[in-house]
Interface confidence: low
């Protein structure tokens, strides 16, 4: 298609330089015609060397684009601002592991882990995430305690046709809390720093569904499931977000062969979601009260509960017990949190439309990678920032809202022709100051079409430097917001600029 | 220039199979994903699935699910359709298009076969 | 699965008149966002691609042809109509499986 648009131009062109010379045009227009014509033959020729190879990004990945990269930053801005805020150190790790480090860390979704070609006898493959990472870099270093986040790219092997919407390459922004410490209190505060985190992200309401990985087991243990079906059939309930339970048990009976009962009696507890009231009644059910792991877990909840109540977030939990999210390393409590469509009918309920961040408690990771078993408790959260870029990105296009993609703060301009030698020394003083400051690459630009770039790339001011305003040792300062304009002495100009654009002391 | 060049029309009876093939030129056939649609005669469009020959994955309208397999030859650039137990509903212009897959995402389909008329009868 | 609804059923108008197809996705969980495309068909022949992702026009359809929305409402308008584009659009998604197709809106000549 783009070829034979490119042979329609050269086709035009010709025709374009066929009537010029009908109409005895100056040899100069020809010449310049004739060139552009050669331009798009000489372009139509390297496109048919160009045929096999077609210019993308690879399959699962994509460029982000300077709207795109501001939005990113705002996003990431509030992100960091309240890991920082709860007083989490910043670490970061290789892009590749050791093929060793990330095996059997991640059951099912194993297949997914990119692996690198041989490179001179270690055997690599791409980070999946940065929990199993974090983890490695705890035992290697000895680290029995550390609260820290981590922002990275990470690498899955989706197929993105599957799972339409999901890239091969995304980042993972975690805060992972390790030590040994009393219980349920880390884990409260991740559970608080993600209602922070959502809540000034401003992307809609939110609800955040908490479970146990002990109850889940105790659970499935009391309903008969044998041991070497747990996590197959984990997988399966963990798709009630997405489908009825009807087609869940279907999935258990028919395709992994659970028994129609045990099917209904998981069924019976998995259907149930609440608040703390829930944790206490399934500490009275019959069944559940007499296994163990159940009891822990749901001991552990009814505390988490008490302290989300301080925190004042109960509001925002749920506890839900289809929550299984699919990773095989947690052990106690695991959360999600998901955007909620506000319902259309008065009286129902709303609904969830999709994870925008998740976590939980996985003890025995470390201890896979000390060689004396040693375990460090952890309990962390990603956000999905992926998600949340481009809920941010829909938002923003609904709005028509213009996004910054500079942090400019004036743009030095000039009102007539030989200024540049003025328009560069202003401009140096000003980066030498600290300030944020542009001005176009012409020797002699147009004011309107300076003007028009200000206006264009909301840039706040304008410094305009013209002859008089020279003599007069002033220079014009216009504001974008207000169209007022004033003269400024130019050695009041740095303060006049940083007043008005509410910016500190600094410099470089 | 791309083009997606179908079999001819078939006459098949009820519970036979039919197989439709697509061929491919124009283009690097494993760069892009295979779609198949149909529609029977005076009604809309319905998407049944897809294959991406680059690395076999397919798609599948649960609809359609157990009676459609969509296969891809790479050497010959030809993606087949098959239909079993066909009944007189899936009389209908079965057609191929090119869906690019791009940022994990597929394209709309961008290039359509002639279609193949499939007509189911006793 | 995500249904797209089309309007209206079908649409009389003459030659040079300006037409507006709209096409509306229902969806319990998501809005289609802009995995919205559209397409003509003209009796025996195969859909024709027109626009994708909602607003983008494709290589070598005529800029008569325009494309808007995002979310759960999309509209197709052809500003001047000429003879050649009397026929049936249809708009479709890709944006889960399985991708679904409005039951489409016949443009005919009044």
């Known amino acids: 298609a783009d070829r034979a648009a490119l042979e329609e131009l050269v086709r035009l062109q010709g025709a374009h330089v066929r009537g010029l010379k009908e109409q005895k045009a100056s040899a100069e227009q020809i010449e310049e015609e004739v060139t552009k014509l050669l331009k798009l033959k000489a372009q139509l020729g390297q496109d048919e060397g160009k045929q096999k190879f077609v210019l993308k990004t690879p399959k699962g990945t994509r460029d982000y684009s300077p709207r795109q990269m501001a939005v990113r930053e705002k996003v990431f801005d509030v992100i960091i601002r309240c890991f920082k805020r709860h007083g989490a150190e910043v670490i970061d790790t290789p892009v590749f592991e050791l093929k060793e480090t990330l095996t059997g860390k991640y059951g099912e979704d194993s297949k997914l882990i990119y692996d690198l070609k041989d490179q001179g006898g270690e055997l690599l493959s791409l980070r999946y995430d940065l929990t199993v990472p974090f983890a490695r870099y705890l035992a290697m270093n000895k680290l029995t305690n550390i609260k820290r986040y981590h922002i990275a790219k990470v690498y899955r092997r989706d197929n993105p046709a599957m799972t339409r919407g999901r890239y091969r390459e995304f980042y993972q922004c975690d805060f992972d809390i390790a030590g040994q410490f009393d219980p349920m209190i880390p884990d409260a505060e991740c559970l608080k720093i993600m209602c922070e985190i959502l809540s000034s992200l401003q992307i809609g309401n939110f609800l955040v569904k908490v479970n146990d990985r002990r109850i889940l087991d105790g659970m499935f243990a009391v309903c008969g499931v044998p041991d070497s079906k747990f996590r197959t059939i984990c997988s399966s309930v963990d798709k009630l977000d997405k489908v009825s339970w009807e087609e869940v048990k279907n999935e258990m009976v028919g395709e992994k062969g659970l028994a129609p009962e045990v099917a209904d009696r998981i069924g019976d507890y998995v259907q149930q979601h609440g608040g703390v009231s829930l944790v206490e009644q399934l500490l009275q059910d019959p069944k559940l009260s007499q296994n163990k792991q159940a009891v822990e877990g749901l001991g552990d909840l009814k505390l988490l509960f008490e302290y989300l109540i301080l925190f004042g977030i109960d509001d925002k939990i749920s506890f839900d017990l289809s929550l299984a999210r699919g990773l095989d390393y947690y052990t106690g409590v695991i959360y999600e949190a998901v955007l909620l469509q506000m319902p259309t009918q008065a009286g129902e309920e709303p609904l969830g439309v999709g994870s925008i961040a998740a976590g939980g408690r996985y003890d025995g990771l470390v201890g896979m990678f000390d060689p004396k078993g040693r375990k460090v408790p952890c309990v962390g959260l990603s956000i999905g920032v992926e998600r949340i870029f481009s809920i941010v990105e829909q938002r923003l296009e609904a709005s028509e809202e213009k996004v910054r993609t500079t942090e400019t703060q004036v743009l030095v301009a000039s009102a007539q022709k030989k200024l540049l030698e003025e328009r560069l020394k202003l401009v140096s003083e000003l980066w030498d100051a600290g300030i944020k400051a542009e001005l176009l690459y012409k020797k002699n630009p147009k004011l309107l079409n300076q003007l028009q770039y200000w206006e264009e790339a909301g840039i706040p001011l304008v410094a305009i430097i013209g002859e008089q305003e020279l003599r007069d040792g002033v220079i014009k300062l216009r504001s974008v917001a207000s169209r007022e304009e004033v003269d400024v002495r130019r050695e009041d100009l740095v303060e006049e600029i940083r007043r008005r654009t509410n910016q500190p002391l600094s410099t470089c | 220039q791309v083009q997606l060049v179908q079999s001819g029309a078939e006459v098949k009876k009820p519970g036979a199979s039919v197989k439709v093939s697509c061929k491919a030129s124009?283009?690097?056939?494993?760069?892009?994903?295979i779609g198949w649609i149909r529609q029977a005669p005076g009604q809309g469009l319905e998407w049944m699935g897809d294959?991406?020959?680059?690395?076999?994955?397919?798609n599948d309208n649960e609809k359609f699910k157990d009676r459609a397999t969509m296969t891809a030859d790479t050497s010959t650039s030809t993606a087949y359709m098959e239909l079993s137990s066909l009944r007189s509903e899936d009389t209908a212009v079965y057609y191929c298009?090119?869906?690019?897959?791009?940022?994990?995402?597929?394209?709309?389909?961008?290039?359509w076969g002639q279609g193949t008329l499939v007509t189911v009868s006793s | 699965e995500i249904v797209l609804t089309q309007s209206p059923a079908t649409l009389s108008l003459s030659p040079g008149e300006r037409a507006t197809l709209s096409c509306q996705s229902q969806?319990?969980?998501?809005?289609?966002?802009?995995?919205m495309h559209w397409y003509q068909q003209k009796p025996g022949q195969a859909p024709r691609l027109l626009i994708k992702y909602a607003s983008n026009l494709e290589s070598g359809i005529p800029d008569r042809f325009s494309g808007s929305g995002s979310g759960t409402d999309f509209t197709l308008t052809i500003s001047r109509l000429e003879p050649e584009d009397f026929a049936t659009y249809y708009c479709g998604h890709s944006y889960e499986i399985p991708w679904t197709f409005g039951g489409g809106t016949k443009v005919e000549i009044k």
């Open positions: 969806s319990v969980s998501t809005s289609t966002y802009n995995y």
């Open positions: 124009g283009y690097t056939f494993t760069d892009y994903c």
């Open positions: 294959i991406c020959p680059g690395d076999t994955y397919t």
């Open positions: 298009a090119r869906g690019e897959e791009q940022l994990g995402l597929r394209n709309a389909m961008d290039y």
